[in-house]
């Protein structure tokens, strides 16, 4: 996922809508002007803000990387939602890229969890039922995995 925090404009473009801050803050989909007197709308598809705020810039929309699919586009109040392509996943501790799911479990292990956009297949020992934490199986059985469907927002 590639994302810059701030949209590049310093001043509002003429077509951007303005309104007055409410209690000193601006609503989602807007940022505050430099003098604090106006709320300026974010640009649809370019930048956004999700909360009441006093941001001087709206936040730049995420662009989904290759290897990701866009589940929902960026709006003025919500960032793009990206998801790993079928057969790949993104772990919480390494969110920068989608990794290929394993195609099967090592010998002596059985698959108990499918490949999803946020987790690899899950393998456990047939007898003990303990999880296998190894990255790559030494010998794979021909057990194929099916991708999960739920989405996770990218931020």
């Amino acid at each position: 996922i590639t994302q810059q925090d701030l949209a590049p404009q310093q001043r509002a473009a003429p077509q951007q809508k303005r309104s007055s801050p409410s209690e000193g803050l601006c609503p989602p989909g807007h940022h505050i002007s430099e003098d604090g007197r106006d709320c300026i709308s974010c640009k649809y598809g370019q930048d956004y803000s999700t909360h009441w705020n006093d941001l001087l810039f709206c936040l730049r929309c995420t662009r989904c990387d290759s290897g990701e699919v866009e589940l929902s586009p960026c709006t003025t109040t919500r960032n793009t939602v990206c998801q790993c392509e079928e057969g790949t996943f993104r772990e919480e501790d390494s969110p920068e890229m989608c990794r290929k799911c394993r195609t099967g479990c090592p010998r002596g292990m059985v698959k108990v969890g499918d490949c999803t956009p946020w987790s690899d297949i899950e393998c456990v020992h047939k007898e003990s039922g303990t999880k296998h934490s190894g990255e790559v199986p030494a010998v794979e059985e021909t057990v194929t995995s099916s991708p999960g469907t739920p989405a996770s927002p990218c931020s």
Partner: antibody, heavy 119, light 106 residues
């Protein structure tokens, strides 16, 4: 003279709760956006929460979202920070701060109150 | 989050010296930068906002400059009361601070 005086800090166990208060004087409290900022021992400053002048709108960084709640009582000229599910990393001096006129940043700060999260 | 990298982390100087502290933003923040002075056990005090505007009552020996990603706080002639820790802050996207520069007596 603008004055902000924090209170309510102390020692609390991990998982515990604490409510900080900030008494404001010397300015029209109800006209100003207010924030809490913290400073962990020997570390830099970190923004914790912001509330609109009337108290209707709030926002937080991800580090405290869902655990901390900022509120205010304009009749009493007081700002509050309710802190729940406290963690060791929340140990810090907590400052209440006022956002200035037409500058969109903090112009006056209180002296701070120390919160220690430890078992 | 925008990271503000302040340097040096500490410096030793004498009364009358010219002192320069720099702050680098991880991305363009325009001129939305403030500088604060903090003494031990005291509240931070606003010196400069919008990168170069002195706050009410701040002596003219304090000046700020910069835009985009590079910012500077200069104390033209250090006074005894200026020995303190100085912080930069960006306020274009939420609020993030530099790690501070401690100005000590040489």
């Amino acid at each position: 003279e603008v004055m902000l005086v924090e209170s309510g800090g102390g020692l609390v166990q991990p998982g515990g709760s604490l409510r900080l208060s900030c008494a404001a004087s010397g300015f029209t409290f109800s006209s100003y956006v207010m924030s809490w900022v913290r400073q962990a021992p020997g570390k830099g400053l970190e923004w914790v929460a912001t509330i609109s002048s009337g108290g209707s709108y709030t926002y937080y960084p991800d580090s405290v979202k869902g655990r901390f709640t900022i509120s205010r009582d304009n009749a009493k000229n007081t700002l509050y920070l309710q802190m729940n599910s406290l963690r060791a990393e929340d140990t810090a001096v907590y400052y209440c701060a006022r956002r200035g006129d037409s500058m969109i940043t903090t112009d006056y700060w209180g002296q701070g109150t120390l919160v220690t999260v430890s078992s | 989050d925008i990271v503000m990298t302040q340097s040096p982390s500490s410096l030793s100087a004498s009364v009358g010296d010219r002192v320069t502290i720099t702050c680098k933003a991880s991305q363009d923040v325009g001129t939305a930068v403030a500088w604060y002075q903090q003494k031990p056990g005291k509240a931070p005090k606003l010196l400069i906002y919008w990168a170069s505007t002195r706050h009410t009552g701040v002596p003219s020996r304090f000046s700020g400059s910069g835009s985009g990603t590079d910012f500077t706080l200069t104390i033209s002639s250090l006074q005894p009361e200026d020995f303190a820790t100085y912080y930069c802050q960006q306020y274009s996207s939420y609020r993030t601070f530099g790690q501070g520069t401690k100005v000590e007596i040489k």
